[in-house]
């Protein structure tokens, strides 16, 4: 559970790869699409506005306990929208919508090597937003195995 | 409970060897990024090293590169610190300590286990 | 390396009064818009156990009477009202950056 409906604070941040392509966001025909591109040198990075939430992560052995705290957070790339995890189509897609928000707006955030960070769907442990063809996509990790792959490691920048 | 367990301190004459053991309990051990912390007989406190989860990144200060290895074996749930080459400067008490999920804090920690560096 | 430096070094602190610890981090402690500074208590012989992470967020099953608040090289904890079983070490950590830092300790008793 989410430990309050307000965030701990907020910050807004450009959003890139682990290898340096732009994550952007362009209005078409009413809704929003994501990108993920190579950005010309003049052109100015999108920003987003990520709100951190404290959250609960329970004890995921006994199922019955709280093993501790997480960060979560959501992206807002502009008023009224936010990105959500579609975990039937494995994507990554923005909608407007009003708070409260809905499960599938909130990614935990996790901090990586090489100072990037991942964002794992609050609605299905173990699945993170990651690059696929050169768009967002929803990727099944392997803790054990691929928890360093770099299509799942993004920056933040201010 | 969440509980961690170290073993395998002891007392060691310069540029002798000690491996330390860290038995993880009451939680998915290979999700979380587990790290070494000494206290000196000064009750100063010094991170030692870091594994991440799925044993992808391993990072360590710089007094112990070259002579200390952490490590992990997910299927015992056990996280090991070989310690070679030891100095004086290495008396501490040595704690497991287990990140949060997500990696941004140390969260919860071990009871330590004393490693003494003495001729 | 991110210097941590805790004052005072020891405090005094009647039953029920407020006791303030101070943490002034030689670069700042910011990273993606956190601060990443965190609060932990030792008792003797146990050890360090997480009060607060990210600044001002108390950690699992801490009291109220514990609070942190700050951001980027300047923070603080504090504890109110003052009880007995707050008698103990107070440390601040960054996790900003590797090297994990340390400030050196507030030893706290009870007047």
């Known amino acids: 559970s989410i430990t309050g409906i307000s965030p701990i604070t907020e910050s807004l941040a450009s959003l890139s790869t682990y290898n340096d392509q732009s994550i952007t966001f362009a209005l078409e025909d009413e809704s929003y699409e994501i990108y993920v591109e190579d950005l010309k040198k003049d052109k100015k990075k999108d920003k987003v506005l990520l709100s951190y939430y404290e959250s609960q992560h329970p004890s995921s052995e006994s199922g019955d306990g709280v093993d501790g705290k997480m960060l979560m957070v959501t992206l807002s790339p502009t008023k009224d929208f936010w990105l959500q995890a579609n975990n039937k189509e494995h994507s990554v897609e923005l909608h407007k919508c009003e708070k409260p928000l809905p499960d599938q707006a909130f990614f935990v955030l996790h901090n990586r090597s090489f100072n990037c960070v991942s964002f794992e769907c609050k609605t299905d442990p173990g699945v993170f937003i990651g690059v696929k063809d050169n768009h967002l996509a929803l990727i099944k990790v392997d803790y054990s195995e691929n928890l360093g792959s770099e299509n799942i490691l993004f920056k933040l920048s201010e | 409970d969440v509980n961690l367990v170290e073993s395998g301190g002891g007392s060691v004459k310069p540029g002798g060897s000690l491996k330390l053991s860290c038995v993880a309990s009451?939680?998915?051990?290979?999700?979380?990024?587990m790290s070494w912390v000494r206290q000196t007989p000064e009750k100063r406190l010094e991170w030692v090293a870091t594994?991440?989860?799925?044993?992808?990144?391993?990072d360590y200060v710089d007094s112990v590169k070259g002579r200390f290895t952490i490590s992990r074996d997910d299927a015992k749930n056990t996280l090991y610190l070989q310690m070679s080459s030891l100095e004086s400067e290495d008396t501490a008490m040595y704690y497991c300590?287990?990140?949060?999920?997500?990696?941004?804090?140390?969260?919860?920690w071990g009871a330590g286990t004393t490693v003494a560096v003495s001729s | 390396d991110i210097v941590l430096t805790q004052s005072p070094g020891f405090l005094v602190v009647s039953l029920g009064q407020r006791a303030t610890i101070s943490c002034r981090a030689s670069?700042?402690?910011?990273?993606?818009?956190?601060?990443?500074l965190n609060w932990f208590q030792q008792k003797p012989g146990q050890p360090p156990k997480l009060l607060i992470f990210?600044?001002?967020n108390r950690g699992s099953g801490v009291p109220a009477r514990f609070s942190g608040s700050g951001s980027g090289t300047d923070f603080s904890l504090n504890i109110h009202p003052m009880e007995e079983d707050d008698t103990a070490m107070y440390f601040c950590?960054?996790?900003?950056?590797?090297?994990?830092?340390f400030g050196s300790g507030t030893k706290l008793e009870i007047k």
């Open positions: 594994i991440s989860g799925g044993k992808t990144f391993t």
């Open positions: 300590t287990r990140a949060n999920y997500g990696n941004w804090f140390f969260e919860v």
């Open positions: 950590q960054q996790s900003k950056e590797v090297p994990f830092t």
């Open positions: 009451g939680f998915t051990f290979s999700s979380f990024s």
């Open positions: 990210a600044a001002s």
């Open positions: 670069e700042s402690v910011a990273k993606y818009g956190l601060s990443l």
